[in-house]
């Protein structure tokens, strides 16, 4: 749906089109539930609420209201060269039965978040890919995105900032003649587990199954994409636990070291996988030392004390170099009782849609 | 009509440090970049650095990072550019320019000659 | 810094000719492309913004195209007034103008 925010002269300073989908989880007297739902197709612009920002004083934003009282608010800043969705809140009302049955709770709610959507002043921002902005217990994914604050005009400008999910990785380039063809794409990898203790117990609950996706360049420069199991059989898992930071360190092989950092939102009581590291060797590559590191993610997210589950693929990106594919993921951080998983807040793609 | 009223021309001498100013009308101040923009003989147009008023972000070009110092006053709507350890290469008019949104650089202020002798 | 190669960087014709000034940018610049015209003794003038589009009360005698890294700009039917430098500027990251081309009549 596309929704305009215009300034005292009728000029749009804000157009955004979307469609949105929630990931809520909400206690019921049975226990912790989840709940999926979209951006209804009469959700509307609070015109009162949403602005182009005043001289001076305060930035645009765009709050969108659907259902029995609940709002979504796009908050805009920029800089001399960008501008970004600076932040992002949702205020739901648990007392709409129609959208959380059973609730325990009748409050009104409010999440927010930071977001990485951001764009070159005098661009709109585009995502066909989900964006995913990861709240207290809410989950909001924007497809097919565009977005476009400080307008000059009434319509959205010629260039566009692309988000990072729609960048084209670097093209497989097929090898030459005399080189060995890329490794046939390998089976989905085996699922283990995995756990880290310290002095005060178990600080870290993971199963997973972990492909590598590199692309990197070869000898013969060429640029080769290949994909790489994990092979629990083969891989010894140590790592730490610490109040604000949880490692799980994996070595494979003898030639490979991959390092997850899980970190937590003392506000929010979330956990969520903050880093990856990755040391390989990769004998036919150029530079066969394969060193790539992303300390600022935003995946894996659960509340502290839960267990964050998604049984389809999920892929994170560290680098154009280097994308993690995880299968059947169950984790948990920080706060492990009994050495067993908590309650389980799905991903997004798993939940069940009304 | 939006206009950049730009102050008056300097001599200064080699190693010194000026400061011009640039006041704005005509528009919402704070809504969009003010550039500067140095002309010179032997360079041609050279852009230095924008400034938005809104929040003080300035970006520079390489060249220029280490010599100009972009500033803002929102109360009085002017932009202020200090240029340091002036030397002969640094005569020049300088001009600030705002964009018209993707438009480029579409309003300019009269220029502000600067000559570095000693 | 985007690098703006600009040349040439002088030319000469005749009135009621054509000129063409060529512009390569250092990496794709998706049609953030202005040119000015500058006088002495005057500012700079925006003649085209966008790779192609006129400003309002410019004559339909400059023309401008390109896409990706090279950029043209032309004025036809050459007339006195058109003596100046001309300079092309990229705002697609941050901004950056040519070396100029100063045009004399013959």
């Known amino acids: 749906a596309m929704f305009m925010v215009k300034n005292g002269n009728g000029t749009a300073c804000i157009m955004a089109n979307f469609s949105a989908a929630f990931s809520v989880n909400y206690d019921t007297k049975s226990g912790p539930k989840n709940m999926t739902f979209d951006l209804p197709s009469d959700a509307t612009v609070v015109l009162n609420r949403s602005s182009c920002g005043k001289e001076n004083t305060s930035d645009p934003s765009l709050v969108i209201a659907f259902g029995r009282g609940h709002t979504l608010t796009l908050n805009f800043t920029r800089n001399a060269t960008r501008y970004s969705v600076q932040l992002m809140s949702f205020v739901y009302n648990l007392s709409d039965t129609h959208l959380f049955p059973n609730a325990s709770s009748k409050e009104i709610k409010t999440v927010e978040s930071i977001t990485d959507i951001r764009a070159d002043i005098d661009k709109k921002y585009r995502c066909v890919s989900g964006t995913q902005v990861h709240m207290n217990n809410v989950t909001v994914t924007l497809h097919d995105a565009t977005i476009q604050a400080y307008l000059s005009n009434s319509s959205f400008s010629r260039g566009e900032t692309r988000c990072e999910q729609d960048r084209p990785s670097p093209t497989t380039a097929p090898p030459a003649p005399p080189s060995p063809s890329p490794s046939p794409v390998p089976k989905s990898p085996s699922v283990d587990k995995y756990n880290v203790s310290g002095t005060n117990g178990t600080c870290l609950l993971a199963s997973m199954g972990l492909q590598l996706n590199l692309t990197y360049e070869r000898k013969d420069n060429t640029t080769v994409t290949r994909l790489l199991n994990i092979n629990p059989n083969k891989t010894s898992a140590s790592g730490s636990c610490g109040a604000h930071l949880v490692t799980l360190e994996l070595h494979s092989e003898g030639t490979t070291v991959l390092l997850f950092q899980f970190g937590m939102n003392a506000s929010s009581s979330r956990f969520f996988l903050q880093g990856i590291q990755l040391n390989t060797i990769l004998p036919d590559a150029l530079v066969p030392t394969f060193s790539i590191s992303n300390h600022s993610l935003k995946a894996l997210q659960a509340t502290v004390g839960n267990s964050y589950k998604c049984n389809t693929e999920e892929h994170i990106f560290v680098s154009k170099m280097l994308s993690l594919n995880v299968f059947s993921v169950q984790v948990q951080a920080f706060k492990v009782d009994s050495d067993r998983f908590g309650s389980v807040e799905e991903c997004v793609q798993d939940g069940n849609s009304m | 009509q939006v206009q950049l009223q730009q102050s008056g021309a300097e001599l200064v001498k080699p190693g010194a440090s000026v400061k011009m100013s640039c006041k704005a009308s005509?528009?919402?101040?704070?809504?969009?970049?003010i550039h500067w923009v140095k002309k010179s003989p032997g360079q041609g147009l050279e852009w230095i650095g924008a400034?938005?008023?809104?929040?003080?972000?300035?970006p520079y070009s390489q060249k220029f990072k280490d010599k100009a110092t972009l500033t803002a006053d929102k109360s009085s709507s002017t932009t202020y550019m200090q240029l340091s350890r002036l030397t002969s290469e640094d005569s020049a008019v300088y001009y600030c320019?705002?964009?018209?949104?993707?438009?480029?650089?579409?309003?300019w202020g009269q220029g502000t000659l600067v000559s570095v002798s000693a | 810094d985007i690098q703006m190669t600009q040349s040439p960087p002088s030319l000469s014709a005749s009135l009621g000719g054509k000129v063409t000034i060529t512009c390569k940018a250092s990496q794709d610049i998706d049609r953030y492309m202005a040119w000015y015209q500058d006088k002495p003794g005057k500012g700079p003038r925006l003649l085209i913004h966008d790779t192609s589009t006129l400003q309002p009360g410019i004559p339909s005698r400059f023309s401008g195209s390109g896409s990706g890294r090279d950029y043209s700009f032309s004025i036809s039917n050459l007339e006195p007034e058109d003596i100046a430098t001309y300079y092309c500027?990229?705002?697609?990251?941050?901004?950056?103008f040519g070396g100029g081309t100063k045009l004399e009549i013959k």
């Open positions: 500027l990229q705002y697609d990251n941050l901004w950056t």
């Open positions: 320019v705002r964009a018209n949104w993707d438009v480029a650089f579409a309003y």
């Open positions: 400034i938005y008023p809104g929040n003080g972000d300035a």
């Open positions: 005509g528009y919402i101040f704070t809504n969009y970049n």
